[in-house]
């Protein structure tokens, strides 16, 4: 549109002047003037601002509190806030990651479909037939059972979800 | 203070191109637009166009439109104007110009605050 | 375009004389006007914005008024630094045109 009906992209109407924004790492210290320019600082050591700002103050950066299982995943800059992820073995209880819970094992007769990660919880699936898993576990997938006849062998006790077959000798009474 | 720096005078041949430059100092590049006017010897001030230094977007006059690009470097504050085809009635002193823009009455105006020193583009052959 | 038409192209005057420049567009432009001064080799200058606004650091002496198509810049008590050469513009329709210009000699 012409004439303008509004201020610039990264500017901000303040005493019927359209002052500029302080870029990002940057908080504002003073309003424009007719007689002067918009006066900005750079965020201090562990402070940031992300975006084109009027901020007077900088946000502090996150904490990775190690007491809740978080450590430093990307170190925060002036423009960017510190991302947090799990020790090990732990995962985000939200998107924010506050805070880690254990990851969680899959049950005997269940296998593990989706090992967890940092920011996600262990997937588990039931073992179908053919498959079993007999321990809790965060890592082990369902086991196919044995094939008992690719060792000449036969089938005693079948397999369930949780068990394998059982495979013995074939009978030899048996034509 | 607002400061705005143009680069050196310069002598080219019709046909050629030319690139003037214009560094600004003492305020933040990326929030204001910025603006090229040039003015022939002896002559009045015409309107070229202007850059949008924090997107690069720019609008050119009709006269220039396929023969003038402007562009900009926000890492070192400095935007360019670009004019290819030289003809010898391109001579002129190029000026670049920051938009400054008041609020008034429901509306915003715009006006040229601060001004480079201009760069002279002189086209013989 | 927008044309916009100054009045008089050249102007001779004395120190302390009151000068009146007009400036007249081809259609109308509500208030989005401005004056600007410039001297020989150097850039132009903004003295007046929004047809009546005086730029700040610009002595009192200059003042424009006007509205729609009709414009007017005045200096009140020329000084000998006001010799110079005086340009309108419209902001009011790409392009953003300029007055021919109103060169102001010492008489």
């Known amino acids: 549109p012409e004439p303008p009906t509004a201020c610039r992209e990264k500017q901000y109407l303040i005493n019927s002047q359209c002052c500029s924004l302080c870029q990002p790492g940057q908080k504002l210290v003073s309003d424009c003037t007719e007689f002067t320019e918009t006066e900005c600082l750079p965020c201090g050591e562990s402070e940031f601002l992300d975006t084109w700002n009027r901020e007077t103050h900088c946000h502090q950066h996150k904490y990775c509190d190690p007491n809740l299982g978080l450590r430093v995943q990307q170190k925060g800059t002036s423009e960017t806030d510190t991302i947090c992820t799990c020790e090990e073995g732990w995962h985000c209880t939200s998107e924010a990651c506050e805070s880690c819970v254990l990851h969680r094992s899959c049950s005997p007769g269940f296998g593990v479909k989706q090992i967890a990660t940092g920011v996600s919880d262990t997937i588990c699936e039931p073992c179908p037939v053919g498959f079993f898993s007999n321990v809790s576990s965060a890592f082990e997938k369902c086991h196919p059972w044995t094939s008992c006849e690719t060792k000449d062998l036969v089938v005693q006790q079948a397999g369930t979800n949780k068990t394998d077959v059982v495979c013995g000798p074939q009978d030899r009474l048996r034509a | 203070q607002v400061q705005l720096v143009q680069s050196g005078a310069e002598v080219k041949k019709p046909g050629a191109s030319v690139k003037v430059s214009c560094k600004a100092s003492?305020?933040?590049?990326?929030?204001?637009?910025m603006y090229w006017v040039r003015q022939a010897p002896g002559q009045g001030l015409e309107w070229m166009g202007w850059i949008n230094p924090d997107s690069g977007a720019p609008t050119y006059a009709q006269k220039f439109q396929g023969r003038v690009t402007m562009t900009r470097d926000t890492s070192i504050s400095t935007a360019y104007m670009e004019l290819s085809r030289l003809r010898s009635d391109d001579t002129a002193v190029y000026y670049c110009?920051?938009?400054?823009?008041?609020?008034?009455?429901?509306?915003?105006?715009?006006?040229?605050?601060?001004w480079g020193q201009g760069t002279l583009v002189t086209v013989s052959s | 375009d927008i044309q916009l038409t100054q009045s008089p192209s050249f102007l001779s005057a004395s120190v302390g004389d009151r000068v009146t420049i007009t400036c007249r567009a081809s259609?109308?432009?509500?208030?989005?006007l401005a004056w600007y001064q410039q001297k020989p080799g150097k850039a132009p200058k903004l003295l007046i914005y929004?047809?009546?606004t005086l730029q700040s650091g610009v002595p009192s002496r200059f003042s424009g008024s006007g509205s729609g198509t009709e414009f007017t810049l005045t200096i009140s008590s020329l000084q000998p630094e006001d010799f110079a050469t005086y340009y309108c513009?419209?902001?009011?329709?790409?392009?953003?045109?300029f007055g021919q210009g109103t060169k102001v000699e010492i008489k």
């Open positions: 929004a047809a009546s």
């Open positions: 003492g305020y933040t590049f990326a929030g204001y637009y």
């Open positions: 110009a920051r938009e400054k823009i008041y609020y008034g009455s429901g509306n915003y105006y715009p006006s040229f605050d601060y």
């Open positions: 259609q109308g432009i509500s208030s989005y």
């Open positions: 513009q419209q902001l009011m329709s790409y392009p953003w045109t």
